[in-house]
Interface confidence: low
């Protein structure tokens, strides 16, 4: 599923991401934009053999199990395939664990490079939330 900007903002808010660990909803929408272009089916292979999955490009070396990544920790205790669902519950729940891990949203390279320090509220402007 490819979400619309406001559609995703509403879904993320429903799942409790607005101001989760101090990060406003705009941060999460911005991260999803530059990680996956709002596509729940996005996958990208990394040079270390791991793969990033879903709308927030969650990594298989640390956070989910795809049965393909040597030394996977599966800290979210989920199959990576769950992160590709049009229902973003699994991605959100895992993202909450990631953002609580100490580095906050710096865990997402695209957020660090494209969203951090910018007017992230622009990503939810005009949305009925």
């Amino acid at each position: 599923k490819v979400f619309g900007r406001c559609e995703l903002a509403a879904a993320m808010k429903r799942h409790g991401l607005d101001n989760y660990r101090g990060y406003s909803l705009g941060n999460w929408v911005c991260a999803a934009k530059f990680e996956s272009n709002f596509n729940t089916q996005a996958t990208n292979r990394n040079t270390d053999g791991s793969t990033d999955y879903g709308i927030l490009q969650i990594n298989s070396r640390w956070w989910c199990n795809d049965g393909r990544t040597p030394g996977s920790r599966n800290l979210c205790n989920i199959p990576c395939s769950a992160l590709l669902s049009s229902d973003i519950t699994a991605s959100v729940n895992c993202a909450k664990k990631i953002v609580s891990d100490g580095n906050g949203m710096n865990a997402w390279v695209a957020w660090r490079n494209r969203c951090k320090g910018t007017d992230v509220q622009a990503w939810i402007r005009g949305c009925r939330l």
Epitope: N39, Q41, A42, T43, N44, R45, G49, D66, G67, R68, P70, G71, S81, A82, L84, S85
Partner: antibody, heavy 116, light 107 residues
Framework: QVQLQESGAEVMKPGASVKISCKAT????????IEWVKQRPGHGLEWIGE????????YYNEKFKGKATFTADTSSNTAYMQLSSLTSEDSAVYYC?????????WGQGTTLTVSS | DIELTQSPATLSVTPGDSVSLSCRAS??????LHWYQQKPHESPRLLIK???QRVSGIPSRFSGSGSGTDFTLSINSVETEDFGMYFC?????????FGGGTKLEIK
């Protein structure tokens, strides 16, 4: 239960192309990798590459880049592998399998014969 | 690419014998090694995943061991239905690779 049904045997001329299909049933097709494996007598099993049907992401063994092309049709839960510029070296049995690092589920295999 | 070398190439045994098949990797692959059985004109069948985990429905006479570069598939008291080819496969890195196989035949 999980099943992978491959298309039937093919006899092709050198230089031609062929498209092999693999229809998946019994699981969520979009969220598991489909792997393609080649088997020739005396050459064992060779991994050709893989496709994730939901996203269309593909990865190829360098040896088969330019030879194999993977596609998937999520409306019919079918994965395809096209082999181009066929030579006698392409004569083999081709398997699709569901990828989990290991391959628990396999198609029955498609025998390709390339002969003039 | 990671090369997997299986030995012996052929193993001739009598039903009731116990056998060990070897698979050696060209570099360490942790426990990311899987074993398959293949009979003539059939698809491979997964027996053991991640070096030692027997797959559901596989008889308990099959067991796997090893880590790093050296792996063993053991069959305790071979039955007639066990004859065929056995392949190992690694999932530690890409491209995935298979061993050349061991043929288990009746003596």
């Amino acid at each position: 239960q999980v099943q992978l049904q491959e298309s039937g045997a093919e006899v092709m001329k050198p230089g031609a192309s062929v498209k092999i299909s693999c229809k998946a049933t019994g699981y969520t097709f979009t969220t598991y990798w489909i792997e393609w494996v080649k088997q020739r007598p005396g050459h064992g099993l060779e991994w050709i590459g893989e496709i994730l049907p939901g996203s269309g992401s593909t990865y190829y063994n360098e040896k088969f880049k330019g030879k194999a092309t993977f596609t998937a049709d999520t409306s019919s839960n079918t994965a395809y592998m096209q082999l181009s510029s066929l030579t006698s070296e392409d004569s083999a049995v081709y398997y699709c399998a569901r990828g989990d690092g290991h391959y628990c589920y396999w198609g029955q295999g498609t025998t390709l014969t390339v002969s003039s | 690419d990671i090369e997997l070398t299986q030995s012996p190439a052929t193993l001739s045994v009598t039903p009731g014998d116990s056998v060990s098949l070897s698979c050696r990797a060209s570099q360490s692959i942790s426990n990311n090694l899987h074993w398959y059985q293949q009979k003539p004109h059939e698809s491979p069948r997964l027996l053991i995943k991640y070096a030692s985990q027997r797959v559901s429905g596989i008889p308990s006479r099959f067991s796997g061991s090893g880590s790093g570069t050296d792996f063993t598939l053991s069959i305790n008291s071979v039955e007639t239905e066990d004859f065929g080819m056995y392949f190992c496969q690694q999932s530690n890195s890409w491209p995935r690779t298979f061993g050349g196989g061991t043929k288990l035949e009746i003596k």
